[in-house]
């Protein structure tokens, strides 16, 4: 039951996380114009990965996609790539995890297959979350660098064709959404990996009853290892009985024909 709950919760947490990563990627508020010490108050600018928006003092807002002819910084392209990779990996992870859910029966899929799929989706969620966190962090670093560069250039650039950055930008809402969403996806992935351990078939060790035979003294000891008499070939305590592959949820305490020799 605990395995099913962990897997289900991991799936839900990852689903929320990936929805957040998609939302953050589409949002326009990755950076917002810093209003402190800014003489320009008639227009307020906020920017996303794909377009820039300006809110006029009249209340009218206009957005435009970035003009590709001017070229975009390599860092921005890298952030876009990281977010898209995160979304794609997350989406594939969600698809895989749906089929891996213990509560869903698809044909005669064995627990070992479900365990492998759970692990795969968990790893995908972890990588997806890391991509989102990395993308948002790279963008945040770019804003911090730009902020201090803008502050240094605030009263320079007069005369000649000098290009200075005058407007300073601070963290927008999308950055926080991205960080939280990436974290949730990461946590969900870890939960799926933990659930995988419980789903994986384990070798069950049975406690056996001690038994005295008429011939050589042979007994089964707990752990399923044959106690060697010194005459047999099993001198290295090799496991001579492999318990049936059963999941944690299916282990039964009833005596079976293998419990007694």
């Amino acid at each position: 039951m605990a395995v099913t709950a962990c897997q289900g919760l991991g799936f839900v947490v990852s689903l929320i996380g990936i929805a957040g990563i998609i939302a953050a990627t589409c949002m326009d508020q990755w950076s917002t114009q810093d209003l402190y010490n800014n003489p320009v108050t008639a227009v307020f600018n906020y920017q996303g990965l794909w377009r820039s928006c300006v809110r006029e003092s009249s209340g009218f807002t206009e957005c435009r996609g970035y003009f590709t002819l001017l070229g975009l910084p390599a860092m921005l392209q890298a952030v876009r790539a990281l977010m898209i990779v995160g979304i794609v990996l997350g989406a594939i992870g969600l698809l895989v995890s749906i089929f891996a859910l213990k509560c869903i029966r698809i044909g005669s899929m064995e627990d070992s297959a479900k365990a492998n799929m759970t692990l795969t989706s968990g790893i995908m969620f972890i990588v997806s979350g890391l991509c989102a966190i990395a993308g948002v962090s790279v963008f945040a670093n770019m804003l911090v660098t730009n902020f201090w560069m803008s502050t240094a250039n605030m009263y320079t650039g007069m005369g000649g064709m000098v290009q200075t950055v005058q407007t300073r930008y601070t963290f927008g809402a999308a950055l926080f959404v991205g960080w939280v969403a990436g974290g949730l996806t990461l946590i969900g992935g870890v939960m799926m990996c933990i659930a995988c351990r419980g789903l994986a078939p384990e070798e069950t060790n049975y406690k056996a009853v001690s038994y005295h035979a008429s011939g050589h003294s042979v007994a089964y000891k707990p752990g399923g290892f044959k106690a060697s008499t010194g005459f047999g070939s099993n001198t290295k305590n090799k496991k001579i009985y492999d318990g049936g592959a059963r999941t944690e949820d299916e282990v039964q305490s009833y005596p079976s024909k293998h419990d007694y020799v």
Epitope: V40, R64, L70, T167
Partner: nanobody, 118 residues
């Protein structure tokens, strides 16, 4: 390459009028504002007036009611109509184009001298 060319500066008597113009050429992001700044000797740069691509305007406290900014989007030109000029309006007037592409860009003109003296 974006270029800003100012014109219209000169010597005017106190109380007189002057019209500055600034033409922007080249390719630039459509979300922007065109502004006029001035810098008197020994002083910091001061925002006089700006007009955004959407038509919003803003004026500095020292010129409110005396100066009027306008823009011709077809010609990518900004005009600053200055009236009731005072000796303290003497400065070098700079045209500024700020584009709102990724993290913003600023372009500056060479500046035009405006002198108010009798």
């Amino acid at each position: 390459e974006v270029q800003l060319v100012e014109s219209g500066g000169g010597l005017v008597q106190p109380g007189g009028s002057l019209r500055l113009s600034c033409a922007a050429s080249g390719q630039f992001f459509s979300l922007n504002y065109l502004a006029w700044y001035r810098q008197a000797p020994g002083s910091q740069r001061e925002l006089i007036a700006l007009v955004s691509s959407g038509g919003s305007t803003q004026y500095g406290d020292s010129v409110k009611g005396r100066f009027t900014i306008s823009r011709d989007n077809a010609k990518n030109t900004v005009y600053l109509q200055m009236a009731s000029l005072k000796p303290e309006d003497t400065a070098v007037y700079y045209c500024n184009l700020h584009t709102y592409d990724f993290l913003g860009r600023d372009y500056w003109g060479q500046g035009t001298q405006v002198t108010i003296s009798s």
